[in-house]
């Protein structure tokens, strides 16, 4: 009888499998695989080699704390003639003496997470078992049978593999691209993502069921949505919007997710201070990409926060057009969430593809602060019964705004306001380019189209179906040049009278600083004038906005809201126009000194010109970039930087990966906050 088969060691072929599975960056010490795809391993036996006629090899793969075959968290499978794609299977690739090369496959619907792989050998009545090692299984956008399959290689590269990108901020009329280091393959990030799954409340409540449900990107997306904020759990980020960030890091100061996730993991899953919508979205994007779900950050301009699902945001103003109070139902200048690509077997056909997931804690969904995934197509069709949270996301892009003016006698009158349309310029980074892609059309039919009316009817959006009033007088806020931080500049109320009558009016112009979520700050410019609008005439009335007025109260959003209220006493009518101005920060210049080569020191010279009338104090540059720096680096400039001159530092980089990388930079000082810059660097082989 043949002697017992004895395993000396197992080579998990980490590097080769990493290349095949697009996980090479994750595969330093661990085997990381994508589900539904073959992988290799080599068994080295002691004494004698494997003999098919006498030896039986059975593999075991388990995940989670309580593995079971019913839950799909435990599998046993034997060697077969060929691997069956889409199921747990194994076959022989090659045999040389005592060395057996095998090919294994995982199902395309296996739960993602950490697995333990074991081998049982039996020869006659003798048997032994061996631990082969651990591997991590991720979603697979390259596998047609996987729920996250994406058939474009360029899109897979962008939405799964690309570690850097842009998040769009600013205002609808001045869209600002902010570079971000997602860094989903950086050291420790995969561990943090798996830990995030393992501390989520659903896991703590029912570990076995949670691990089983990790086979679904819908489930995982919803868990991530809830875990990126810390409102109900040991989530990653604490949200704060009040401009008091002294005991943490200002949301505007972050330049990447890596630092955030590392802090969270290293401090025992304690909340990281502080996040706002784009930080929540960016961290969710990192986590989802890391787990293998194609994901992108999107920005919706003039985003509504509708709490009572009436698709209506009502503002009450006094006779001067000033808001009576800051309330929770508001229009945010912009709001960010993520979209993840997946099938929706739980929904009707046609609702697969991009799903909106919003990790910013706004409203509870099924008792938890999370939102989505909801089919973007369902939003476009006005199908508000769709899981999950369709009505909330529909409102974010479609709510109507009504302005009421409370007159001195206490009565309220509706004001006409055509300047604010909710859900505009919905933006994401283009595939493979540093440009913005407008994806508004994926959420909304063209304004005024029959399809749009049909959607509003289906969604019972009565306000949007009402005819708009026209008075023959129109007003809009226009801007001049030089709207950058440190400058004085003019804005104009442009008023047109398209009627045959003369109109006696009063114009109240006011500029106030504003946070990106719509909360108003102090006034920084006003004008109150009486004017006569001649028939068929156009008027342009300027409002001067001075640096000395806005400098002390501008938030890190760099936004100023200009409001014009045109009152016509004779007709007892009010016409309102608003515009959000984004003040451009100075440009960060980045020069690369030397030739960028892999595993060789590289120096970046980073500079910024002081645009203000006084010196800049307490200046700090912070840089990071996946493949360029092991961790974030900060360089302080202890000496003041006088007006008009540059602040300049040199930073040592150590590129580890060849190819295209982005060096992302943040600059902070006393009077300039969260100035961002980036530079593309192509690293060549050594």
């Amino acid at each position: 009888m043949a002697e017992e088969l004895n395993l000396e060691r197992c080579d998990l072929e980490i590097q080769a499998n990493g290349r095949d599975h697009h996980t090479a960056d994750l595969c330093q010490e661990k085997l990381v695989l994508r589900r539904g795809q073959r992988f290799r391993l080599t068994l080295y036996f002691e004494g004698r080699g494997y003999e098919a006629s006498v030896d039986r090899l059975t593999f075991g793969a388990v995940t989670g704390p309580d593995p079971s075959e019913e839950a799909g968290t435990k599998a046993r499978f034997s060697l077969s003639d060929d691997v069956e794609e889409g199921s747990w299977s194994a076959s022989v690739l090659d045999q040389q003496d005592n060395v057996l090369s095998l090919q294994l496959c995982t199902p395309a619907n296996a739960p993602v997470g950490q697995y333990r792989l074991s081998l049982e050998t039996s020869t006659g009545y003798q048997g032994s078992s061996f631990m082969l090692g651990h591997f991590i299984l991720l979603f697979n956008a390259w596998c047609p049978a996987d729920d996250v399959y994406l058939d474009s290689e360029a899109e897979r590269r962008e939405y799964v593999l690309t570690q850097q990108g842009f998040i769009y901020q600013g205002s609808v009329k001045f869209i600002k691209s902010v570079p971000w280091n997602f860094g989903q393959f950086e050291d420790g990030i995969l561990d943090a993502c798996l830990m995030l799954l393992d501390v989520n409340p659903k896991f703590l409540k029912d570990r076995s069921r949670d691990c089983s449900r990790r086979s679904s990107p819908i489930y995982v997306g919803r868990v991530v949505s809830g875990m990126v904020n810390c409102n109900d759990d040991q989530g990653v980020l604490l949200g704060r919007w009040d401009n008091n960030y002294g005991d943490g890091i200002s949301p505007m100061a972050w330049i990447g997710s890596v630092d955030i996730l590392r802090r969270w993991k290293e401090h025992g899953c304690q909340q990281v201070k502080y996040g706002q919508c784009w930080v929540f979205a960016a961290v969710a994007c990192t986590v989802l990409r890391c787990l293998g779900i194609p994901t992108r950050v999107v920005t919706n301009y003039n985003s509504a926060h509708d709490q009572n699902s009436n698709l209506l945001i009502e503002y009450f103003r006094n006779e001067y057009g000033e808001l009576e109070s800051n309330k929770s139902e508001m229009i945010w200048n912009f709001h960010c969430w993520v979209e993840s690509w997946m099938t929706r077997p739980d929904l009707q056909p046609g609702y697969e593809g991009w799903q909106a997931i919003d990790p910013t804690p706004q409203e509870k969904s099924e008792g938890t602060y999370c939102c989505g995934p909801v089919s973007v197509r369902a939003i476009k069709e006005g199908d508000l019964s769709t899981k999950y949270d369709a009505s909330f996301v529909f409102a974010e892009v479609n709510a109507d705004v009504v302005d009421w003016i409370r007159q001195s006698d206490g009565s309220v009158l509706k004001s006409i306001n055509n300047s604010l349309v909710v859900g505009q310029k919905i933006s994401t980074k283009s595939v493979g380019r540093d440009d913005r892609e407008d994806i508004t059309y994926t959420y909304k039919y063209p304004e005024g189209s029959p399809e749009e009316r049909e959607v509003f009817t289906r969604a019972n959006h009565l306000n949007k179906l009402a005819e708009k009033e026209e008075t023959g007088v129109a007003m809009r806020i226009r801007v001049g040049d030089g709207m950058s931080l440190g400058n004085d500049f003019d804005v104009f109320a442009h008023i047109g009278n398209d009627t045959s009558e003369s109109r006696e009016c009063r114009l109240l112009l006011c500029a106030r600083t504003v946070s990106y979520n719509g909360v108003l700050g102090p006034e920084c410019g006003t004008e109150d004038i009486n004017l006569t609008l001649d028939p068929y005439s156009e008027n342009s009335i300027p409002l001067r906005i001075l640096y000395e007025k806005y400098s002390g109260c501008l938030t890190e959003s760099n936004l100023i809201k200009v409001r014009g209220l045109l009152v016509e006493p004779a007709a007892n009518s009010y016409l309102l126009a608003e515009r959000d101005l984004y003040l451009e920060n100075p440009e960060i210049k980045i020069r690369i000194l030397g030739e960028p080569k892999q595993n060789r020191k590289l120096v970046a010279e980073v500079s910024l010109k002081n645009p203000l009338s006084d010196s800049l104090y307490d200046c700090v540059f912070t840089v990071e970039g996946a493949g360029l720096t092991k961790e974030q680096k900060s360089v302080e400039v202890s000496d003041p930087v006088p007006a008009g001159d540059a602040v300049k530092v040199r930073v040592d980089l150590f590129p580890t990966d060849i190819g295209l990388h982005k060096l992302v930079v943040n600059f902070q000082c006393d009077k300039l906050k969260s100035v961002k810059g980036y530079r593309n660097i192509i690293i060549g082989p050594a």
Epitope: Y617, S638, D639, P640, P642, A646, D670
Partner: antibody
């Protein structure tokens, strides 16, 4: 017109503390830092430190740490310097200034004498 | 700290003469951005100092063109091409490149 108006002369006993003021007008107070400079009788100028009214951040010459405390009050557009544990060595004229410009206070004379 | 040393301590001149005052720093006062923030001030008896020159050689507005500054690295000079009575007083150099900022000891310009 930009002006820095300093408080009047002080005569104090050794060991005591004194707080002198510098009221700024004619410009936005939070836009510029205010420096303090010491000049002992018949001697040269010595930089004490600055206060940044924008964020209340102060930087000091190491020599004056523990001796001088710089603060500011936005509502009254006033910068203050408090000097503690006074000795005769602290007798001097103290100027507030917006350095790198021609805006200086008229000086506050401090005499420390028992 | 950067030590600023002025020479001479006292400079007697006749009206109409040229005057040169030297200022030497104990180490380079070039800022990390490449600029040198070396300034000159004039203090007349009983008055606050007046601002004359910034960034080594730039005259502040209203300063007569008989005043000129030069130098680099650690050696700097203030020149008055033709001294007038209103120029008398104590001249101070000042470095604003590195905290703590420092003044020179002063040079007294007086009539011979």
């Amino acid at each position: 017109e930009v002006q820095l108006q300093q408080s009047g002369p002080e005569l104090v006993k050794p060991g005591a503390s004194v707080k002198m003021s510098c009221r700024a007008s004619g410009y936005t107070f939070t836009t510029y830092v205010i420096h303090w400079v010491k000049q002992k009788p018949g001697q040269g100028l010595e930089w004490i430190g600055y206060i940044n009214p924008y964020n209340d951040g102060a930087r000091y010459n190491e020599k004056f740490k523990g001796k001088a405390t710089l603060t500011s009050d936005k509502s009254s557009t006033t910068a203050y310097m408090e000097l503690s544990s006074l000795t005769s060595e602290d007798s001097a004229v103290y100027y507030c200034a917006r350095l790198s410009s021609d805006y200086w206070g008229q000086g506050t004379t401090l005499t420390v004498s028992s | 700290d950067v030590l600023m040393t002025q020479n001479p301590l006292s400079l007697p001149v006749s009206l109409g003469d040229q005057a040169s005052i030297s200022c030497r720093s104990s180490r380079s006062i070039e800022h990390s951005n490449g600029n040198t923030y070396l300034e000159w001030y004039l203090q007349k008896p009983g008055q606050s100092p007046k601002f004359l020159i910034y960034k080594v050689s730039n005259r502040f507005s209203g300063v007569p063109d008989r005043f000129s500054g030069s130098g680099s690295g650690t050696d700097f000079t203030l020149r008055i091409s033709s001294v007038e009575a209103e120029d008398l007083g104590v001249y101070y150099c000042f470095q604003g490149s590195h905290v703590p900022f420092t003044f020179g000891g002063g040079t007294k310009l007086e009539i011979k």
